[in-house]
């Protein structure tokens, strides 16, 4: 008998390469088999659980970047006057949720904030739970 | 053929909000189905393996707190005179191990500390070795 | 009908008691039943996917260190003039990639550098992928 | 500029107690492994505790394990030795030292020390 | 554990090199560090890791290490070395001292 075979395991790396003032950071998924999705600029979350959250990245210039996963409720990660993160986290997300960034700059100037090694990394940690397609 | 589920995976969030100085942090699991159990204010572990921890919370006076899983063995995590924590680790945990807070605190005061945002989640890693309940 | 058990996870955790300069760390697996195996004093990748890596310890002098998974490829952490670490992150990882260290001290003499502590894991986050033995 | 300043150093009674303290600046105290060594009159240098970087590992010289305490505070850069059951034999200059790196025990720099007298 | 011998005494003419050394099983394979304790004063390391020496530490002096033997040399002693020197090492986490050498410039 052949032994079972895990289905695959709920995960994305998506990675950004700039970030909008009061708006959100632009987010590719760079690979074609990713077993999540992005929609409007978000990921969006299919399955309940806890999720293993990597957040990294260089900014062009001083930042408060945010990661939202709901509305009303507070952020997963939230970084004030920041030009650089690595930041590992954990979190519980449900069906529906949907990860996405918001950025606020303190300049003047309204230029896109480039980043260098912009990633984040979503990986359900709870195979086995509810999950809606 | 319906391709085989996961099992649930061992996991638990515990919420606390409060510590009692040269004691530790009262937890309670805010969900019922969770697959891990509390018992005498203490994580009780049934599976051995690696386990992903996540510790969280702001605290109403500077303290000392440690997250221990074994006498005689050093701590998971610990942190001298903070007034918050958000720390994540990896540690190998065996069936009778039980992870439990100790807390110090530097006031001549003692009243219970109280707790902001305090959670405490571990999320199990090697799903398939040996577990006993 | 008995309910489908998890294949083992590939994870490892190896010691090290000492680095040697401009070369590495002498890693070594305490356990005998590891699901990944050392070679070369590297750790051989035979699963693609996420992984998530956690590393401490303790030197006995300041020294720069970088784990590498690939040639060519930037390190998975790179700490530059440190006396301990204690660090997680999530990388890709995959099939032939060999995990590995690289150590420069800054003092004149050639002596091994003590490490206390000295601990690397890696635990797959992705079982059901591409794998190959 | 690295400095290491040392006090608690008294005149007390055998079986009595003290607490030295040791206050450093000028470098990333959390990083390093510290050491008491003490002096007695007219002899050489003998190692009594060290501590590691972040507290988790100490270490004693035999004749005064369970007697006396190594810890740190890397909020606040100070060392501390807190010393109970005193003996005459314990009589010396006490030496803050700071280690090369956070574990190892090879010194790099040394206090100016503090004066314990153990006498009835 | 590990022991560290030191001859108690040794006389150098002034402006001559003077040559101190300190004995232990293998201790080519540890780092030593060398320490000046003038009388009354605190002690001073002038050696760390064999041969390195510290900020503001004169030229004249020098360390060596292989073998069983480490070496501090002191090319043109002056009086104001006249001091006690101390080896040092690192031992499984504790710290080894040599018993000390009193160094006399005549």
């Known amino acids: 008998q052949v032994p079972p075979q895990y289905p695959p395991i709920q995960s994305i790396r998506v990675q950004f390469t700039r970030c909008e003032n009061e708006k959100g950071c632009i987010i590719t998924s760079p690979s074609k088999d990713e077993t999540m999705k992005v929609q409007d600029n978000s990921i969006i979350i299919n399955c309940d659980g806890f999720y293993l959250i990597s957040l990294k990245g260089y900014f062009s210039e001083e930042l408060s970047l945010s990661l939202y996963y709901r509305k009303g409720r507070g952020p997963l990660f939230s970084l004030s006057k920041v030009t650089s993160v690595d930041s590992i986290g954990v979190a519980y997300l449900a069906f529906k949720d949907k990860v996405y960034f918001n950025v606020t700059t303190h300049s003047t100037s309204y230029k896109d904030i480039q980043v260098n090694g912009g990633e984040l990394i979503l990986i359900h940690q709870n195979p086995g739970g509810f999950c809606a397609y | 053929q319906v391709p085989p589920q996961y099992p649930p995976i061992q996991s638990i969030r515990v919420q606390f909000t409060r510590c009692e100085n040269e004691k530790g942090c009262i937890i309670t699991s805010p969900s019922k189905d969770e697959t891990m159990k509390v018992q005498d204010n203490s994580i009780i572990i049934n599976c051995d393996g690696f386990y992903l921890i996540s510790l969280k919370g702001y605290f109403s006076e500077e303290l000392s707190l440690s997250l221990y899983y074994r006498k005689g063995r050093g701590p998971l995590f610990s942190l001298s005179k903070v007034t918050s924590v958000d720390s994540i680790g990896v540690a190998y945990l065996a069936f009778k191990d039980k992870v439990y807070f100790n807390v110090t605190t530097h006031s001549t005061s003692y009243k219970d500390i109280q707790v902001n945002g305090g959670e405490l989640i571990l999320i199990h890693q090697n799903p398939g070795g040996f577990c006993a309940y | 009908q008995v309910p489908p058990q998890y294949p083992p996870i590939q994870s490892i955790r190896v010691q090290f008691t000492r680095c040697e300069n401009e070369k590495g760390c002498i890693i070594t697996s305490p356990s005998k039943d590891e699901t990944m195996k050392v070679q070369d004093n590297s750790i051989i990748i035979n699963c693609d996917g996420f992984y998530l890596i956690s590393l401490k310890g303790y030197f006995s002098e300041e020294l720069s260190l970088s784990l590498y998974y690939r040639k060519g490829r930037g390190p998975l952490f790179s700490l530059s003039k440190v006396t301990s670490v204690d660090s997680i992150g999530v990388a890709y990882l995959a099939f032939k990639d060999k995990v590995y260290f690289n150590v420069t001290t800054h003092s004149t003499s050639y002596k091994d550098i003590q490490v206390n502590g000295g601990e690397l894991i890696l635990i797959h986050q992705n079982p059901g992928g591409f794998c190959a033995y | 500029e690295l400095h290491l300043v040392e006090s608690g150093g008294d005149l007390v009674k055998p079986a009595g107690s003290l607490r030295l303290s040791c206050v450093a600046s000028?470098?990333?105290?959390?990083?390093?492994?510290m050491s008491w060594v003490r002096q007695s009159p007219g002899k050489g240098l003998q190692f009594v505790a060290g501590?590691?970087?972040?507290?988790?590992?100490?270490q004693y010289r035999d004749d005064v394990k369970g007697r006396f305490t190594i810890s740190r505070d890397n909020t606040e850069k100070t060392l501390y030795l807190q010393m109970n059951n005193l003996r005459v034999e314990d009589t010396a200059m006490y030496y803050c030292v700071k280690d090369q790196g956070s574990w190892g025990g090879n010194f790099d720099f040394w206090g100016q020390g503090t004066l314990v007298t153990v006498s009835s | 554990s590990y022991g560290l011998t030191q001859p108690p005494s040794v006389n150098v003419t002034l402006r001559e090199t003077a040559h101190i050394t300190c004995g232990g099983d293998?201790?080519?394979?540890?780092?030593v560090q060398w320490i000046q304790q003038i009388p009354g004063q605190a002690p001073v390391v002038i050696i760390y890791k064999d041969r390195n020496r510290p900020t503001g530490i004169p030229e004249r002096f020098s360390g060596a290490n292989s073998g069983n033997t480490a070496t501090l040399t002191i090319s043109g002693a002056l009086a104001e070395d006249e001091a006690d020197y101390y080896c040092?090492?690192?031992?499984?986490?504790?710290?080894?001292f040599g018993g000390g050498t009193h160094l006399t410039v005549l």
């Open positions: 000028g470098f990333t105290f959390s990083s390093f492994r």
């Open positions: 040092q090492v690192g031992d499984s986490g504790t710290s080894v």
């Open positions: 501590i590691n970087s972040d507290g988790y590992n100490t």
């Open positions: 293998s201790i080519g394979s540890k780092y």
